[in-house]
Every structure is written in C-alpha cells, then in structure tokens.
C-alpha cells in the first residue's frame, strides 16, 4: 500500500547553481494524505539548522504533490550554502535531505565556469 | 494539459547528423529538467541524456557521448538532441521526457520521432 | 552501471487475478530510507506512463489495483484485480544513480 506517512521529496546531494541578483524558488516537495503539515524552511550553520522565519514562502500544487516554496527576490551572495526543509506531522518531525546553493556573484559572472566545464564538476551543480 | 511533441526524425546516412526538437507546453518549462529516452525497434528503453531547468547539469549515457548534445531554449519552450557520427546501432524512436521531483522520475513523455540510419 | 534484472519476461494472467513483476538491481538504489526506483507501463505504438516513483507512490491518476513495494536490491509491481487495459509491457527504472538504467521489460497478457 501507498504510505500515508507525509514524505519530502529532495532528492540527496541536490545543488543549484545560481546567479545573484536573480529570482530564484526553492521547492520542497510534499505529499501528504489528510492535513497539510506545517512546514518550514532552514539554514544549515555546521551541524545546527537555523530556521527561517522572516521569509517569503508559499505554496503550490502539482499532481498529488503540494511545493512549499522559499523565494529569493533577488539571490543574494550570502544565499551560498545548504538548505532543509522539515515538516511537522501528528507531533513528528521529517526533515529533507538538504539542498545546497552555489551561489555567483554577479561582479564575478565573467568568471563563472563554462558549460562544459560546469558538466565535468558535478559538484557544482543540480539535478 | 501538459504536452511534449518530438520533431526531427527521419532517414539519415551513416556517419550523418540529425537534429530532433521537443516542443513544451501545458508546463512552466523553465522550471522542468528534461530526458531524452530512445527505444531501438522491439527493443527496451535506454536513457539517452538529461539537461537541468538552468543548463547547468548536463549528463549523458556512455553510448553517445561526445556525439550528441542535450540543450534548450527555454523562452521558446524547447528542448534539442544534436546527433552526429549516428550509427546503425542509434536507429531508434527518440522520446523527450518531463523530469519529476527533480531526478525522481519522468512523469510525462512525447509520442516520440523515430530516427533510421541506414545507407 | 546499475542492471535491473526483470522478471518474469511475459506472463499472462487472467482477469480479475493478480501480476506480480519483480525487479532486482546489481547493486543497492537505496539511500538514507530512500528508495529511487520507478515503474512504467507501455503499450504497443504508445509512450511509457510513470506508474510508480520512489517504489511506491502511485503517480497522479494512476488506479489504485497498481502498487509498487521493495527496497535495497528487489522491487515489485503488483496489479491486483488485473484488467483488460493493463495488457502492456512494464519497465522497472533507477534513478539512485547516473546513467539511469531500465529493466528489460515484462510483457503482460491478460487471459
């Protein structure tokens, strides 16, 4: 049977390579059965996660999957770094895997690696 | 309604090139990395190459590497497969294919264009 | 490279019964309680429908007689009550790993 246990959806090791200065969405996929859980985005700083409370988010629905969403309007340099989602269901907490930002500077844009190059680093980039 | 419609196949000479479109719509596309998928004639499925929502990740199968080249053109909504140095071996029908969830699945696929090389 | 090893290669069921298709990978598709396996259906002239992603959550509109279980190495695809539509070829896929890799295919007759 299909679990009807809420599950995330970011895949491991997911990375976007993105320009400051750009609008960028960050999704968290959802599923879920009944209630839509209460949902939140955070920051990984080492080995702690800070929330992020004061930030556009929203939501959106796709198929049988609800996207919360983290915008960024515009990205910012210090955007950089890994994010998580965790969803809180009947007094559980799920948490994503986390998603990590790559994060150009726009004054530094010139400098940003080739196309091909980009595909011979995976680990610069995302699914 | 989401819609992906291949164009592009057709007859092609050993050693020749060929390039097949994916047209996009129903869908923010810029949004949706995408596959190419081809099926040899009563034969199997085989992955062919990915290209993420930005451009920036690019992969493809060892089969085509360095001969085919995955891209897009999100304004207009399109997807590309630039094949060349075709071989018997490639003579297939090509399908492009929505990505889901970012590198879960493929949730939607074009009808496919088919691709004959042959002398 | 991943090898998915389906199995049977054809069956027939009769209608009403239950198709069971296994699916075993050459190495784990696994990771941190995640399990990246898909199943597709495809019928003859036709492109090949998600069923099934992430093992066992039915894609949208997808009925509820298909259902997908396993985890580490060995899959399955069950369609239980089996009807007449569902005769088709299905294919096991993994996305754990780059290049994504299928099954070779079950061929599904219905008695």
């Known amino acids: 049977k299909e679990s009807c246990d809420v599950q995330l959806y970011i895949k491991r090791q997911s990375e976007h390579s993105i320009l400051a200065g750009d609008p960028f969405e960050l999704e968290c996929p959802v599923k879920y059965c009944a209630n839509r859980p209460h949902v939140t985005w955070c920051k990984l700083n080492g080995t702690t996660c800070v929330k992020l409370e004061d930030r556009q988010t929203s939501w959106k629905e796709e198929k049988n999957i609800s996207f919360f969403i983290l915008h960024f309007e515009p990205v910012l340099p210090n955007d950089n770094g890994s994010y998580r989602c965790s969803a809180n269901f009947q007094s559980n907490l799920i948490e994503s895997h986390s998603t990590t930002l790559y994060v150009t500077d726009v004054k530094s844009a010139s400098e940003r690696p080739s196309k091909d190059e980009m595909a011979s680093r995976p680990w610069l980039l995302y699914r | 309604d989401v819609q992906l419609v291949e164009s592009g196949g057709g007859l092609v000479q050993p050693g020749g090139s060929r390039k097949l479109s994916c047209a996009a719509s129903?869908?923010?596309?810029?949004?949706?990395?995408m596959h190419w998928v081809r099926q040899a004639p009563e034969k199997g499925l085989e992955w062919v190459a990915y290209?993420?929502?930005?451009?920036?990740?690019?992969y493809y199968a060892d089969t085509v590497k360095g001969r085919f080249t995955i891209s897009r053109d999100n304004p207009k909504n399109t997807l590309f497969l630039q094949m060349t140095s075709l071989r018997s071996e490639d003579t297939a029908m090509y399908y492009c294919a929505r990505d889901w969830l970012r590198g879960y699945a493929m949730d939607y696929w074009g009808q496919g264009t088919s691709v004959t090389v042959s002398s | 490279d991943i090898v998915l090893t389906q199995s049977p290669a054809s069956l027939a069921v009769s209608l009403g019964q239950r198709a069971t298709i296994s699916c075993k990978a050459s190495?784990?598709?696994?990771?941190?309680?995640?399990?990246?396996m898909n199943w597709y259906q495809q019928k003859p002239g036709q492109p090949p429908k998600l069923l099934i992603y992430?093992?066992?959550n039915l894609d949208f509109g997808i009925p509820a007689r298909f259902s997908g279980s396993g985890s580490g190495t060995d899959f399955t695809l069950n369609i239980h009550p089996v009807e007449e539509e569902d005769a088709a070829t299905y294919y096991c896929q993994q996305s754990n790993e780059d290049p994504w890799t299928f099954g070779g295919g079950t061929k599904l007759e219905i008695k």
């Open positions: 992430a093992a066992s």
């Open positions: 190495q784990s598709i696994d990771y941190d309680g995640d399990s990246y």
């Open positions: 290209i993420s929502s930005g451009i920036s990740t690019i």
């Open positions: 129903g869908f923010t596309f810029s949004s949706f990395g």
